[in-house]
C-alpha cells in the first residue's frame, strides 16, 4: 500500500475521522445505502466499499473529509491485496486440509451463525 | 438451507468427518490447491470452496466421505446466503456509518493485519 503508516494505524485514524465528519456525512437525508444484515463483515467488503463510493459521490469534498475517503481507499487497496493472497499459492492437499480445518474451526467459534 | 441440523452443528460434524477421512483425502500426492497465505478466512471463501471442489473431483466417493462433501456444500450454501444478505437492505446513511464504524473497529481488533 503506498502509505507511510501501517494499516493498523490507518484504520485507527480512519475511525477517528469518521467520528469527526459524521454530521457532514449524514447531511443527505434521502440517500440510502445497502447495509449488511449480519456481522460477518469480511463477507461484505465489496458492498461496504460500494457504499463508501456512493457516500463519497454525495459528500461535499474538502479539508479532512478528503483524508477520510483517501484512507478508506487505502484500506480497500489493503483488502484487495489480501484477497489476491487467497489464491496465489498452490499447496499440497495436506496444507489445504490444515487450512480448511482452521477455517471450519473459526466458523464454529468466531462466526456469527444463525440457526 | 435444506438441512435438519443447525449450521453450527453441521460445522462441528464436518470437522469430525474431515479428521476421519484425512488419509483418503491426501492420497493424491501431486494435486495442488490454492491455500491462503493469511488468516482472514472470510475474505477467501470463494477460493476455499473452489479448492474443495477440486478435492472432491479427485477423491473416490462412497460412504461417509460423501457426507463430508455434502456437508461442505451445505456450508457453502449457508455462506452464499450470508453474502446475499450483504446488499439486500438499503438503509439511511446513519445506519451505514454505524456499520462502517463496526467494520473498521473489527478490522482494528480482530483482523490479521501485517504492517
Amino acid at each position: 500500500i503506498p502509505t507511510e503508516i501501517p494499516t493498523s494505524a490507518l484504520v485507527k485514524e480512519t475511525l477517528a475521522l469518521l467520528s469527526t465528519h459524521r454530521t457532514l456525512l449524514i447531511a443527505n437525508e434521502t440517500l440510502r445505502i445497502p447495509v449488511p444484515v449480519h456481522k460477518n463483515h469480511q463477507l461484505c467488503t465489496e458492498e461496504i466499499f460500494q457504499g463508501i463510493g456512493t457516500l463519497e459521490s454525495q459528500t461535499v469534498q474538502g479539508g479532512t473529509v478528503e483524508r477520510l475517503f483517501k484512507n478508506l481507499s487505502l484500506i480497500k487497496k489493503y483488502i484487495d491485496g489480501q484477497k489476491k493472497k487467497c489464491g496465489e499459492e498452490r499447496r499440497r492437499v495436506n496444507q489445504f486440509l490444515d487450512y480448511l480445518q482452521e477455517f471450519l474451526g473459526v466458523m464454529n467459534t468466531a462466526w456469527i451463525i444463525e440457526s | 438451507i435444506p438441512t435438519e441440523i443447525p449450521t453450527s452443528a453441521l460445522v462441528k460434524e464436518t470437522l469430525a468427518l474431515l479428521s476421519t477421512h484425512r488419509t483418503l483425502l491426501i492420497a493424491n500426492e501431486t494435486l495442488r490447491i490454492p491455500v491462503p497465505v493469511h488468516k482472514n478466512h472470510q475474505l477467501c471463501t470463494e477460493e476455499i470452496f473452489q479448492g474443495i471442489g477440486t478435492l472432491e473431483s479427485q477423491t473416490v466417493q462412497g460412504g461417509t466421505v460423501e457426507r463430508l462433501f455434502k456437508n461442505l456444500s451445505l456450508i457453502k450454501k449457508y455462506i452464499d446466503g450470508q453474502k446475499k444478505k450483504c446488499g439486500e437492505e438499503r438503509r439511511r446513511v446513519n445506519q451505514f456509518l454505524d456499520y462502517l464504524q463496526e467494520f473498521l473497529g473489527v478490522m482494528n481488533t480482530a483482523w490479521i493485519i501485517e504492517s
Epitope: 499447496r91 495436506n94 496444507q95 487450512y99 480445518q101 473459526v106 | 495442488r32 497465505v37 493469511h38 490479521i112
Partner: antibody
Framework: QVQLVQSGAEVKKPGASVKVSCKAS????????INWVRQAPGQGLEWIGY????????RYNQKFKGRATLTVDKSTSTAYMELSSLRSEDTAVYYC????????????WGQGTLVTVSS | DIQMTQSPSSLSASVGDRVTITCKAS??????LSWIQQKPGKAPKTLIH???RLIDGVPSRFSGSGSGQDFTLTISSLQPEDFATYYC?????????FGQGTKVEIK
C-alpha cells in the same frame, strides 16, 4: 520489534522429559504458526513440527510423533515444546521459528535452547 | 519424506569470489524452498524464500534461483561476514526437510 525468546539451557537424565518455552512479542501471537527445529552438535537442522496458536492444532514429523508435544499459552503468547523419554541422541539445540504466513518460510527464529541428555 | 541433497558439503573461497551452492529435491517442490544462513553458535537466519525472493534487509549479493527439483543459492561477491553454513529448506510438504548444509570457509 518481533522477537522469540526461549528458555535457558537444560540438563536431563535419559528417560526424563524436557519442556522448552518460546515467548513471542512484537506481533499478534495467534496470527502465525510456530515451528520447532532442532540441531544436534555439529549436525544439520531437523524439523520437529508446528503448532497453530490460532486453533491449537499441531502437526508433527513422524520421527517425533508420540514423544514431542507442542502446546501454546495464548494468555502469555508462549509456545512450548515438550520432549519425553529422552535419550542421548536428543542432545541438541532446540529452536522455535515463526511462519511468515500459512505454511510459509521461517521469518523469525528464537535464540535456541541447549538440551543436554546425560546420565 | 522429501530428501534435500545439498552440494558441495563445504567450500573454501576468498573475499570477492562468486559462490554457488546447489540443492536438489527428491521430488517436485514447486518453488517452496528457502535458504538459511547460520553462523557458529548463532541462531539460523532466513535469507531467501520461495526459491528466489530476497528477504527484507538481506544484501542483494545473495540471490536464489530454480523451481521443481533443482535450486541454487549464489553469493555474487563474498564478504567477510558471509563465512557461515548455508542450508536449504523445503516447506512444500510435511515433514519439512533441510539439506545437510554447506560450510563456506575462508581460503
Amino acid at each position: 520489534q518481533v522477537q522469540l525468546v526461549q528458555s535457558g539451557a537444560e540438563v536431563k537424565k535419559p528417560g526424563a522429559s524436557v519442556k522448552v518455552s518460546c515467548k513471542a512479542s512484537g506481533y499478534t501471537f495467534t496470527n502465525h504458526h510456530i515451528n520447532w527445529v532442532r540441531q544436534a552438535p555439529g549436525q544439520g537442522l531437523e524439523w520437529i513440527g508446528y503448532i497453530n496458536p490460532y486453533n491449537d492444532y499441531s502437526r508433527y514429523n513422524q520421527k517425533f510423533k508420540g514423544r514431542a508435544t507442542l502446546t501454546v499459552d495464548k494468555s502469555t503468547s508462549t509456545a512450548y515444546m515438550e520432549l519425553s523419554s529422552l535419550r542421548s541422541e536428543d542432545t541438541a539445540v532446540y529452536y522455535c521459528a515463526r511462519d511468515y504466513g500459512n505454511f510459509w518460510y521461517f521469518d523469525v527464529w528464537g535464540q535456541g535452547t541447549l538440551v543436554t541428555v546425560s546420565s | 519424506d522429501i530428501q534435500m541433497t545439498q552440494s558441495p558439503s563445504s567450500l573454501s573461497a576468498s573475499v570477492g569470489d562468486r559462490v554457488t551452492i546447489t540443492c536438489k529435491a527428491s521430488q517436485d517442490i514447486n518453488s517452496y524452498l528457502s535458504w538459511i544462513q547460520q553462523k557458529p553458535g548463532k541462531a539460523p537466519k532466513t535469507l531467501i524464500h520461495r526459491a528466489d525472493r530476497l528477504i527484507d534487509g538481506v544484501p542483494s549479493r545473495f540471490s536464489g534461483s530454480g523451481s521443481g527439483q533443482d535450486f541454487t543459492l549464489t553469493i555474487s561477491s563474498l564478504q567477510p561476514e558471509d563465512f557461515a553454513t548455508y542450508y536449504c529448506l523445503q516447506y512444500d510438504d510435511f515433514p519439512y526437510t533441510f539439506g545437510q548444509g554447506t560450510k563456506v570457509e575462508i581460503k
